[in-house]
C-alpha cells in the first residue's frame, strides 16, 4: 500500500541495506524510491540531541514483509519508498540548501555570480552531481562566489556538514534542463575501452543503455551480445566513464555494441521501463516466489504487482499440465539486474513494469496508427485537444497539446480578443467535434500564460500555456506528448504530422473529424527564401511540400506538429502562421518548441 507521509521522531529498526547522505528527508525518500531494493528509510535530521556525524544520514532499508518495527527517536524521520505508489515519480530536485556543505570530489572550481549560475554550470557539466556555492557573505575572502562542482560514485554526497554562508544543490539534469548533447546512436561492432565503474547483466544493448542512463556515474557503455565469443562475458553490460566525458578508446570488435548515457534526453525516452519480453531466455537471481500463470504477460503482471519483484522468468506449461498454466518465477537481485542470463532453455523473461512510472508518461507507446487517409482514428493523437470559446457562442477556437497533467501548450495568437480564461473550455480525447454536447466533460482554464515577448505570430514567440483547473487522468485517448530534449537540437526528424480540425482549403469551415497530414520539415534557409518579407528565426521551424497541397490551415493554429523519433512522439512545432494554406512554395511556419523548453519548464514547474 502507498504511504506518502513522513513519520516524525520515528526510526525503523533493522533491514539496513546501505547508508547515504541527503540534505532532507524528502530527498531521502526519492533516493530510496530509485534504489533497486529500498522499501523504507530512516533519515536523521540535525538536532542538538544527535551526534553531528549522524546528521543527514539516510539509511535505506528492505523488508520481506514490506514493513519494520518502529522505535521512537528524536530527530529521526522515517517513511516508505514511492515504489508502492502508482503516481508519477521524478528525481528532479530544484531545492537549494542554505548553510549546508555537501561533500564529494571537488573536481572543478570557478567564480559564479549566483547560486543559480552555479547550479546551471553543474547541470551542463557531464560529471556534476551536485554543487556547493560560497556566497558573497562567506567569511574567507578568496572563497567568496566560488562554485564547486562535485561528483561521487553514488551521485549523493559522501557527507553533509553545516557551514555558514554557503548553499548547496543538485544538478538539474533530471529536470530536463541540461544543454548537454543527447547521443542516441548505438555503435555496432565497437568496444569503448575506457574505465569501468560497474558491470551488470542485460538482455540487450537497449536495456544496457537505460541502465547506464540512470546510473549516476555512467557516461557511456559497452555491451557484449549473446553471440560474443567469450561465453563468460555474454550479455555483460560495462558501465563506463572518462575524464573528458567521451570515450577515448574505440576498438572495432564484432558482436559488441557501445553507446552513450541518455541522461540529457531521459525526459523523452523511457529509461527505467524495460517493457520487452525476451524469448528463450532465463534470468537468474534470488527467487522471491514461484506462482502459476497463464502466460508470460500474466507473469509480468504478477511481478509488477509484487513490490519486491524486479524481473521474472516464465516457463510455459508442458502440454495440458496444470490447467495450461506455466511457472512464473519472481526474482530480485542487489542491483535490479539478473545475476546471469542463460539462453536456449525455453524460458520467457522480462522486467517489472513498476518502474515505468519513473519515466515521463509521454514516452508510453501509443496504439499503431492508420497509414493513408486524412481522417484520424480514435486514440491516434491522444495529446491533441480542441480549445473552445463560449463567447459569443460556443465554437472550436484552436488546437493544443497535452504536455502535463495540468498543462496545454498552444499558440499565443489564439487568444487575440480573449479577455478571460473563464470563456475557454478544453476538450481532450475527442475525435469528432460532433461528440461535444452540453453535457460533455471539459477542463476549465485557470490561467493563460502568453510569452511576454509575443506581439504577433509572424514575428515569433507564438507560444502560450494553459493551466487547467483540474488535472487530466491519463488514458489511451488522452495522454501527454514529449517535449523535444534540448540535447536533441541536431536531430533530423523525418516522420512529422500536423493535425487539427481546421479548414481543408482557404475558404472552408471547421472539420468534424480530426484531420492529419504527413509533412516534411524544411530547412530555415529554404523557408527564408519562400518568405522574403519576413524574418524566419531559429525559434521558428517550417514544414511543407514544395508543390503545396498539404498544410495546416485556419483552425489548426496552436495544434501540434508531432514527429516520431526512436518510437517516441515529440512536440516539435506549434502551428503558427503561413501565407494562405497549402500553397506551392509556401511552407507552414511553426513555433520551434525546442527553443522554448526552458520557458515551458520555468512556467510549469514554478512553485
Amino acid at each position: 500500500e502507498c504511504v506518502t507521509q513522513l513519520l516524525k521522531d520515528t526510526c525503523f529498526e533493522g533491514g539496513d541495506i546501505t547508508t547515504v547522505f541527503t540534505p532532507s528527508a524528502k530527498y531521502c525518500q526519492v533516493v530510496c524510491t530509485y534504489h533497486p531494493r529500498c522499501l523504507l528509510f530512516t533519515f536523521t535530521a540535525e538536532s542538538p540531541s544527535e551526534d553531528p556525524t549522524r546528521w543527514f544520514t539516510c539509511v535505506l532499508k528492505d523488508s520481506v514483509t514490506e514493513t519494520l518495527p518502529r522505535v521512537n527517536r528524536t530527530a529521526a524521520i522515517s517513511g516508505y519508498s514511492f515504489k508502492q505508489c502508482s503516481h508519477q515519480i521524478s528525481a528532479c530536485n530544484k531545492d537549494i540548501y542554505v548553510d549546508l556543505d555537501m561533500k564529494g570530489i571537488n573536481y572543478n572550481s570557478s567564480v559564479a555570480k549566483s547560486a543559480q549560475e552555479c547550479q546551471e554550470r553543474c547541470t551542463d557539466d557531464v560529471h556534476c552531481h551536485f554543487f556547493t556555492y560560497a556566497t558573497r557573505q562567506f567569511p574567507s575572502l578568496e572563497h567568496r562566489n566560488i562554485c564547486l562542482l562535485k561528483h561521487t560514485q553514488t551521485g549523493t554526497p559522501t557527507r553533509i556538514t553545516k557551514l555558514d554562508k554557503v548553499v548547496s544543490g543538485f544538478s538539474l539534469k533530471s529536470c530536463a534542463l541540461s544543454n548537454l548533447a543527447c547521443i542516441r546512436d548505438i555503435f555496432p561492432n565497437t568496444v569503448f575501452a575506457d574505465s569501468n565503474i560497474d558491470s551488470v547483466m542485460a538482455p540487450d544493448a537497449f536495456v544496457c543503455g537505460r541502465i547506464c542512463t540512470h546510473h549516476p556515474g555512467c557516461l557511456f557503455f559497452t555491451f557484449f551480445s549473446q553471440e560474443w565469443p567469450k561465453e563468460s562475458q555474454r550479455n555483460l553490460c560495462l558501465l563506463k566513464t572518462s575524464e573528458s566525458g567521451l570515450p577515448s578508446t574505440r576498438i572495432k570488435k564484432s558482436k559488441a555494441l557501445s553507446g552513450f548515457s541518455l541522461q540529457s534526453c531521459r525526459h523523452s525516452i523511457p529509461v527505467f521501463c524495460h517493457s520487452s519480453f525476451y524469448h528463450d531466455t532465463d534470468f537468474l537471481g534470488e527467487e522471491l516466489d514461484i506462482v502459476a500463470a497463464k502466460s508470460h504477460e500474466a507473469c509480468q503482471k504478477l511481478c509488477t504487482n509484487a513490490v519486491r519483484c524486479q524481473f521474472f522468468t516464465y516457463t510455459p506449461a508442458q502440454a495440458s499440465c496444470n490447467e495450461g498454466k506455466g511457472k512464473c518465477y519472481l526474482k530480485l537481485s542487489s542491483n535490479g539486474s539478473p545475476t546471469k542470463i542463460l539462453h536456449g532453455r525455453g524460458g520467457i523473461s522480462g522486467y517489472t513494469l513498476r518502474l515505468c512510472k519513473m519515466d515521463n508518461e509521454c514516452t508510453t507507446k501509443i496504439k499503431p496508427r492508420i497509414v493513408g487517409g486524412t481522417a484520424s482514428v480514435r486514440g491516434e493523437w491522444p495529446w491533441q485537444v480542441t480549445l473552445h470559446t463560449t463567447s459569443p457562442t460556443q465554437r472550436h477556437l484552436c488546437g493544443g497539446s497535452i504536455i502535463g497533467n495540468q498543462w496545454i501548450l498552444t499558440a499565443a495568437h489564439c487568444f487575440y480578443g480573449v479577455e478571460s480564461p473563464k470563456i475557454l473550455r478544453v476538450y481532450s480525447g475527442i475525435l469528432n467535434q460532433s461528440e461535444i454536447k452540453e453535457d460533455t466533460s471539459f477542463f476549465g482554464v485557470q490561467e493563460i500564460i502568453i510569452h511576454d515577448q509575443y506581439k504577433m505570430a509572424e514575428s515569433g514567440y507564438d507560444i502560450a500555456l494553459l493551466k487547467l483547473e483540474t488535472t487530466v487522468n491519463y488514458t489511451d485517448s488522452q495522454r501527454p506528448i514529449c517535449l523535444p530534449s534540448k540535447g536533441d537540437r541536431n536531430v533530423i526528424y523525418t516522420d512529422c504530422w500536423v493535425t487539427g480540425w481546421g479548414y481543408r482549403k482557404l475558404r472552408d469551415k471547421i472539420q468534424n473529424t480530426l484531420q492529419k497530414a504527413k509533412i516534411p520539415l524544411v530547412t530555415n534557409e529554404e523557408c527564408q527564401k519562400r518568405y522574403r518579407g519576413h524574418k524566419i528565426t531559429h525559434k521558428m521551424i517550417c514544414a511543407g511540400y514544395r508543390e503545396g497541397g498539404k498544410d495546416a490551415c485556419k483552425g489548426d493554429s496552436g495544434g501540434p506538429l508531432s514527429c516520431k523519433h526512436n518510437e517516441v512522439w515529440h512536440l516539435v512545432g506549434i502551428t503558427s502562421w503561413g501565407e494562405g494554406c497549402a500553397q506551392r512554395e509556401r511552407p507552414g511556419v511553426y513555433t520551434n518548441v525546442v527553443e522554448y523548453v526552458d520557458w515551458i519548464l520555468e512556467k510549469t514547474q514554478a512553485v
Epitope: V191, F192, A193, D194, S195, N196, I197, S199, T222, P229, K230, S232, Q233, L236, L238, K240, T249, I251, K252, K253
Partner: nanobody
C-alpha cells in the same frame, strides 16, 4: 586457475628499448583479446595497447610509433616491444586478458571473464 605472468621489465635510460612478455596458462589464449595497461604512481590505470583475437591492434596516442604489440598463439604469449622510451613511460605494466578497460582506475579489479597479471615495473631514467 587462469594465470598471466609478465616479464621483461627493468630499468633503462631514456631513448632505450625493452621488450615485455606475458605468458598465459589455463585458458584458450587464441580466442582471447589481450592488452597491456600501465599505472604510474598516483595515476589511474591506462590502456597502452590491445591485440584482439583476430590480430587487430590498438595503441594509445602517447605510444603510437614507439611501441609494438604482437602475439604468438603457439606459445600462449603476448609481447610489447617498447622503443624510444621516455621518463613518462615509467610505470608498472600489466598484462590483461579480455579486460576492456580498467575498473575504478586501478589495474587489478576485473569483471566476469577478465583477468590481470601481477605487473612488471619499467623505470626510465633521464
Amino acid at each position: 586457475q587462469v594465470q598471466l605472468v609478465e616479464s621483461g621489465g627493468g630499468s633503462v635510460q631514456a631513448g632505450g628499448s625493452l621488450r615485455l612478455s606475458c605468458t598465459a596458462s589455463e585458458f584458450t589464449f587464441d580466442d582471447s583479446d589481450m592488452a597491456w595497461y600501465r599505472q604510474a604512481p598516483g595515476n589511474e590505470c591506462e590502456l597502452v595497447s590491445t591485440i584482439t583475437s583476430d590480430g587487430g591492434t590498438y595503441y594509445a596516442d602517447s605510444v603510437k610509433g614507439r611501441f609494438t604489440i604482437s602475439r604468438d598463439n603457439s606459445k600462449n604469449t603476448m609481447y610489447l616491444q617498447m622503443n624510444s622510451l621516455r621518463a613518462e613511460d615509467t610505470a608498472v605494466y600489466y598484462c590483461a586478458a579480455d579486460q576492456w578497460g580498467s575498473a575504478e582506475g586501478d589495474c587489478t579489479s576485473s569483471y566476469p571473464g577478465g583477468y590481470w597479471g601481477q605487473g612488471t615495473l619499467v623505470t626510465v631514467s633521464s
